[in-house]
């Protein structure tokens, strides 16, 4: 079995998580990609996905999550802005490749958000001034429906699939509470 590795990000409320997931560009450049959260004992849940086919660099925003897919560099950039303590958890980037199950991109991201004043949002460990001129808007894209025959009793392995419904959408005040991923990096 492939050993799953995690990269830990410790950030404060209000800051921005800014991570990059790289992929084999020749193989997956225009494939649809997604950002998922993994909870113990559950299947990964899709929080946001790129369009299909994925558009080069064009941002897709779902609430506080922004995806940007840079085809020429084989890179999916994921940003979660204005982080909240409840956003803490384990995340992963995946590539949708129907009819097969999603392909996970390493490494998984262990996000730890703590309370504490952060003058202005930054990313990674760094606090940097930014200016938000207008509230984030939501672009919509359709995330495909995946089901898996397996029952998951622990943090799922690489090949586990997402079970979000196509018309689902995120609770914009708490990205870890998935209610329904919108039709819309």
């Amino acid at each position: 079995a492939t050993k799953l590795t995690e990269e830990k990000y410790e950030l404060k409320e209000g800051q921005t998580l800014d991570v990059k997931c790289d992929y084999t560009l020749e193989k997956f450049a225009s494939s649809q990609k997604a950002w998922q959260i993994i909870r113990d004992g559950e299947m990964p849940k899709t929080l946001a996905c790129t369009e299909r086919p994925s558009k080069n660099s064009h941002p897709v925003q779902v609430g506080r999550i922004i995806l940007e897919d840079y085809h020429d560099h084989g890179l999916l950039r994921v940003r979660m802005v204005n982080l909240q303590v409840e956003d803490s958890g384990l995340y992963q980037c995946v590539i949708y490749q129907p009819p097969k199950e999603p392909h996970m991109l390493f490494d998984r991201i262990r996000l730890v958000v703590t309370k504490g004043f952060s003058g202005t949002p930054g990313s990674n460990e760094n606090s940097t001034q930014n200016v938000y001129k207008i509230p984030p808007t939501t672009t919509k894209a359709l995330c495909p429906l995946y089901t898996s025959p397996r029952t998951v009793t622990q943090a799922p392995p690489k090949s586990t699939a997402d079970v979000s419904t196509p018309d689902s959408e995120i609770n914009l005040t708490n990205v870890t509470d998935i209610i329904r991923v919108p039709v819309f990096n």
Partner: antibody, heavy 117, light 107 residues
Framework: EVQLVESGGGLVQPGGSLRLSCAAS????????MSWVRQAPGKGLEWVAN????????YYVDSVKGRFTISRDNAKNSLYLQMNSLRAEDTAVYYC??????????WGQGTLVTVSS | DIQMTQSPSSVSASVGDRVTITCRAS??????LAWYQQKPGRAPKLLIY???RLQSGVPSRFSGSGSGTDFTLTISSLRPEDFATYYC?????????FGQGTKVEIK
Amino acid sequence: EVQLVESGGGLVQPGGSLRLSCAASGFTFSSYWMSWVRQAPGKGLEWVANIKQDGSEEYYVDSVKGRFTISRDNAKNSLYLQMNSLRAEDTAVYYCARDYGDAFDYWGQGTLVTVSS
Amino acid sequence: DIQMTQSPSSVSASVGDRVTITCRASQGIRKWLAWYQQKPGRAPKLLIYAASRLQSGVPSRFSGSGSGTDFTLTISSLRPEDFATYYCLQAHGFPWTFGQGTKVEIK
């Protein structure tokens, strides 16, 4: 072919203002973060500021915060840098660059800003 | 901010030589490092991104390696047009930061 062309540089006195422009062509300007990077004479490169695709977020290096403002006009495929309260240490060639996720992949030819009395 | 330290600051070499430039990050940046070439009076040109991926159109004599904190740019056989200043850029932690540059001069 991707092209970035800066303009607006020149000689200005300390405390003065200048507005730099960057005209972009050959790519979908509105889909990319854009940055200004500068290089003092005989020195290395320093990122100055960047702006999100729709202009809703701006970031600045500490040394220019409160003095410089980055903006863009996607309808005109143009990037701007408004520089106020200029100091001698702001003297540099200013480059407009396209952010490509993990690198600045295209750069303009640069425009020289000289702050001197 | 993440500091990037390049070495050496300058290197004298001859056409055909193998040249190696190193860049060290003050903290881990995974593979998010790019290399640039700059000639006098010109804008920087992207050579390598993601530590080892060659930018389109860049000759294969340029190669990059490394991850975490230590990275290397290698020019396998120096050509006359390669005499220039080379910079590394980390794109992991915001703000992105450059190394101070390495000048490759003619011996």
